[in-house]
């Protein structure tokens, strides 16, 4: 078989790479297999870029054409200029190079023309019918930037393989695109992978330094690790850091990404700029800083009091009218001397009775007995030390007065970016597990966005929600998906609430925090795309299918479904992110699977019910949504999207987006 | 000059196998597509399918798949038709032609040279 | 497949006359079309190719036009060595290269 047939193989430089495919395609399948990896048709300007196409090209036979990224519409010559009236398909005839194979002659161009590279001699271009098959196409990759391919060292078993976010594989690369992936293989048995990723400082490197094929294990020089070293079961040594730091980009070493963080209340680390700020119980970001903090007027959300409603700097109070006095749960009025019977008439036999005693609600405690998982966006709730204002009564609401939460701003997730108070926020005093579900709630403004109900029977044990574990390889940046990693957590000891936590993975600098919802900017709106929920959690999810769109209800309602639970003051997103304490390092996160689990609705950013579509929405038809690369996890699996890569430096910088600008013109081309 | 011949039995017994050669001379015989196209007695043209000197490539009209097989010896500038289990229908002048690859600056794949043709009759 | 329906399928002419012949494509095949001159007992010759360049050493009374589904052949002075019979080809690769059934051009 031919040997310049037979792979596709690339050159790249600090800025770009060409890429030949020797697949018969014609001129419109070529420009779309370039742009669905990616990039586009071939555009060499520049002298230098011609040379790097030849050298890619080589001495191929003279019967082979390739497709670059030239064509002319029909009477369109313009034979005194340099490309004859054809356009680049970036939408441009800038040019400082051209090769045509003959002069210009004065015909009337009648027709549309394509242009194909000669793989032979000195690969000139030949104008000819778009509707060709020709023996193979040349696309083109701008980013960024790029890594230059890693030095061999003494104890490698081979080169390193690379592998291009464009999905070519070779050891025959000089520089390396940003989001590539470096494998490198040990003579001891183990091995490494570096990806090309954006440093701190600027630029791009590798995400590891060398050496990559130190000595056996964690004992010499603990493996080059900062603080831990953990010898994988496949052999190889990577390190981890303690609790409230974060591995640096060379991959050994150690930073506190909160050392700096201009946070006024609490610091976190995580999100893209490293940190994310929180605020304490009762307060919320500023919107015009969100490392600033603001009191939350509580007494605005509708039924907070029964009757009466007093706002404090960092909290509020319920009083009651004359003759009326503030029952047990420091919420509800009844007449004086009436106290707790008509609570009780009116909640009805689903609610638990007011006066359990302490042994009952250990009990209580030792029942619930569910696996915890997580879903994106659910409010988080966690036991911490004693905060410095709690709430110390617990809301009972009648089947006509639910909390109403109202429609969030933007700042869940909270915004990323002070005094480091160890990550443990002021938190909702719970006693008892919440059961979450969604109903029709009177909303309290015409802000709140539409609230889609779900209810649920009771479930057994055997129909809990399910523990879902996704393990996903790392990822450059524009590919890393929210992560979705959960395990079972140990049963919460007696008169302690579930905790809901998470830690995020450690991520190179410039990623989207995980577990946020992935938000893209396009023009003036924002999309926010979360991951789909797994298919198969029947009953709960086949309900929330049924009756939800693909992405879940704009509003998050509370229907508190026990006697004793927490009041939550407000659901601006300060307070419903105010409870993130760290787990362990294996990234567990947790949700209480309530043994009458309802709906769990996502709380999101207001969307308009336009956009919600599929997480990826490619704005040309002929594009494809990356699917993520995953370990099979145990089953169910969870199957997350990719946000696609954002466009960057040109000719990629037209992108899908530039697609969508011109997709009348390109469509009338192509 | 540009030349090619084609040559081969003139009669083949129905179900047997018709083996044509085509000889090409005057270019660089990896560097051009080869053709086949046969003409029925009185009627138009068909194309068989053509074959890559360079690469062994081939691309065989539906019509023929699992019956037409096109070889090529580059030593000999040589290619190859066979066409198994003939009948009457087969019986046809069989032609083979290069592929153009450029012409005064355009590529095209239209067939610039043919050969003389060979009559082929199918016949017990 | 991709079909080639040509017209007419014979025509007479006097020395002299312009001559058309038309070739519809069945799909778009761009500018992929050749027109081939066969005289009796010989192989066909090609005059046409990329549906109007005129290929070497091909007089320039015969000339093509045409793009997309629609192609005409011209001589616009019909001599008596054009009798033959003229074909039009389409050879976009895909799925493969088909004729039009031909067209035999006479002398009145």
């Known amino acids: 078989q031919d040997p310049w047939a037979a792979e596709p193989r690339a050159a790249c430089g600090p800025s770009s790479c060409y890429a030949l495919f020797p697949r018969r395609r014609t001129f419109l399948e070529a420009w779309r297999a370039c742009r669905e990896l990616g990039g586009d048709l071939a555009t060499p300007r520049t002298p230098e870029e011609a040379q790097r196409v030849d050298s890619l090209v080589g001495a191929g036979p003279a019967s082979r054409l390739l497709w670059i990224g030239l064509q002319r519409q029909a009477r369109q010559c313009q034979l005194q200029r340099p490309l004859r009236g054809f356009t680049w398909t970036t939408g441009d005839q800038d040019t400082a190079f051209t090769n045509w194979a003959q002069p210009a002659s004065g015909g009337p161009c009648p027709a549309q023309r394509c242009v194909a590279l000669e793989a032979s001699g000195e690969h000139r271009w030949l104008e000819g019918s778009c509707t060709l098959a020709v023996d193979g196409y040349l696309c083109q990759f701008g980013f960024e930037g790029a890594c230059p391919a890693l030095q061999d060292e003494a104890g490698q078993a081979g080169p390193a393989v690379y592998t291009t976010p464009f999905h070519l594989v070779s050891t025959e690369f000089e520089w390396l695109p940003f989001g590539s992936v470096a494998a490198v293989q040990c003579q001891a048995g183990r091995g490494a992978s570096l990806l090309c990723v954006k440093q701190p400082e600027g630029g791009v490197g590798w995400s590891r330094a060398g050496p990559l094929c130190l000595g056996t294990g964690c004992s010499p020089d603990n493996g080059g690790c900062e603080h831990e070293c953990v010898e994988e079961v496949d052999g190889h040594v990577s390190c981890r850091c303690t609790e409230g730091f974060r591995l640096a980009a060379d991959g050994r070493s150690c930073e506190d990404p909160c050392a700096q963080a201009p946070c006024e209340q609490q610091c976190e680390p995580g999100g893209p700029q490293g940190y994310s700020c929180h605020c304490r119980l009762g307060f919320r970001p500023a919107e015009d800083d969100p490392h600033r903090c603001v009191d939350t007027d509580e007494c605005q959300i509708a039924g907070v009091c029964q009757q009466m409603c007093v706002n404090y700097v960092g909290g509020f109070e319920c009083y009651c009218s004359e003759g009326h006095e503030l029952e047990a749960d420091g919420i509800s009025c009844s007449p004086a001397g009436a106290m707790g019977a008509q609570a009780s008439q009116d909640l009805g036999d689903e609610l638990l009775d007011d006066g359990e005693d302490e042994e009952d609600e250990d009990e209580a405690w030792k029942a619930f007995n569910g696996g915890w998982t997580e879903m994106p966006g659910i409010l988080w709730m966690e036991p911490t030390q004693p905060p410095d204002f709690a709430l110390a009564y617990r809301p009972s609401f009648p089947e006509d007065r639910e909390p109403q939460i109202p429609y969030p701003e933007p700042t869940w997730p909270p915004p990323l970016s002070a005094p480091r108070v160890p990550y443990h926020s002021s938190v909702l005093s719970v006693t008892r597990p919440v059961v979450v579900s969604a109903t029709h709630p009177t909303l309290p403004s015409a802000h709140q966005p539409p609230v889609i109900p779900a209810t649920h029977p009771a479930l057994s044990r055997d129909h809990q929600i399910p523990v879902i574990a996704a393990n996903y390889p790392d990822l450059p940046s524009a590919y890393q998906p929210g992560i979705l990693s959960v395990s079972h957590s140990a049963q919460p000891p007696a008169h302690q609430p579930p905790m809901i936590s998470t830690k995020y993975p450690e991520l190179f600098p410039a990623h989207q925090s995980p577990m946020f919802p992935d938000t893209r900017v396009a023009g003036t709106q924002t999309t926010t795309h979360l991951p789909g929920i797994p298919p198969n959690h029947a009953p709960l999810v086949t309900t929330l299918g049924a009756q939800l769109p693909p992405q879940a209800p704009d509003a998050l309602v509370l229907r508190t479904q026990a006697t004793q639970l927490p009041i939550i003051p407000t659901a601006q997103p300060s307070l419903t992110t105010t409870s993130r304490s760290p787990v362990s390092p294996a990234h567990q996160i947790s949700v209480p699977a309530a043994t009458q689990p309802a709906a769990l609705p996502t709380l999101l950013p207001s969307q308009s019910p336009t956009n919600q579509t599929s997480p990826i929405s490619p704005t040309h038809p002929h594009s494809k949504a990356p699917q993520i690369p995953r370990e099979d996890g145990p089953s169910p699996k969870l199957a997350l999207w990719l946000p696609s890569p954002a466009p960057t430096a040109a000719p990629t910088a037209l992108g899908e987006a530039g697609l969508a600008e011109h997709s009348q013109r390109d469509d009338r081309w192509l | 000059q540009v030349q090619l011949q084609e040559s081969g039995p003139g009669l083949v017994r129905p179900s047997q196998t018709l083996s044509l050669t085509c000889t090409a001379s005057?270019?660089?015989?990896?560097?051009?597509?080869i053709h086949w196209v046969r003409q029925p007695p009185g009627r138009g043209l068909e194309w068989i399918g053509y074959?890559?000197?360079?690469?062994?490539?081939?691309t065989y009209n539906q019509k023929f798949k699992g019956r037409v097989t096109m070889l090529v010896d580059t030593s000999s500038n040589t290619a190859y038709l066979r066409l198994s289990s003939v009948t009457a229908e087969d019986t046809a002048v069989y032609y083979c032609?290069?592929?153009?690859?450029?012409?005064?600056?355009?590529?095209?794949?239209?067939?610039?040279?043919w050969g003389q043709g060979s009559l082929v009759t199918v016949s017990s | 497949d991709i079909q080639m329906t040509q017209s007419p399928s014979s025509l007479s002419a006097s020395v002299g006359d312009r001559v058309t012949i038309t070739c519809r494509a069945s799909?778009?095949?761009?500018?992929?079309v050749a027109w081939l001159q066969q005289t009796p007992g010989k192989a066909p010759k090609l005059l046409i190719y990329?549906?109007?360049n005129r290929y070497t050493g091909v007089p320039s009374r015969f000339s093509g036009s045409g793009s997309g589904t629609d192609y005409t052949f011209t001589i616009s002075s019909l001599q008596p060595e054009d009798i033959a019979t003229y074909y039009c080809?389409?050879?976009?690769?895909?799925?493969?290269?088909?004729f039009g059934q031909g067209t035999k051009v006479q002398i009145k």
């Open positions: 074959i890559n000197p360079y690469d062994d490539d081939t």
């Open positions: 080809q389409q050879y976009t690769n895909y799925p493969m290269y088909t």
């Open positions: 799909q778009n095949v761009g500018t992929a």
């Open positions: 990329s549906a109007s």
């Open positions: 005057g270019y660089t015989f990896t560097d051009y597509v």
């Open positions: 032609a290069r592929r153009g690859n450029s012409y005064d600056g355009y590529f095209d794949y239209s067939m610039d040279y």
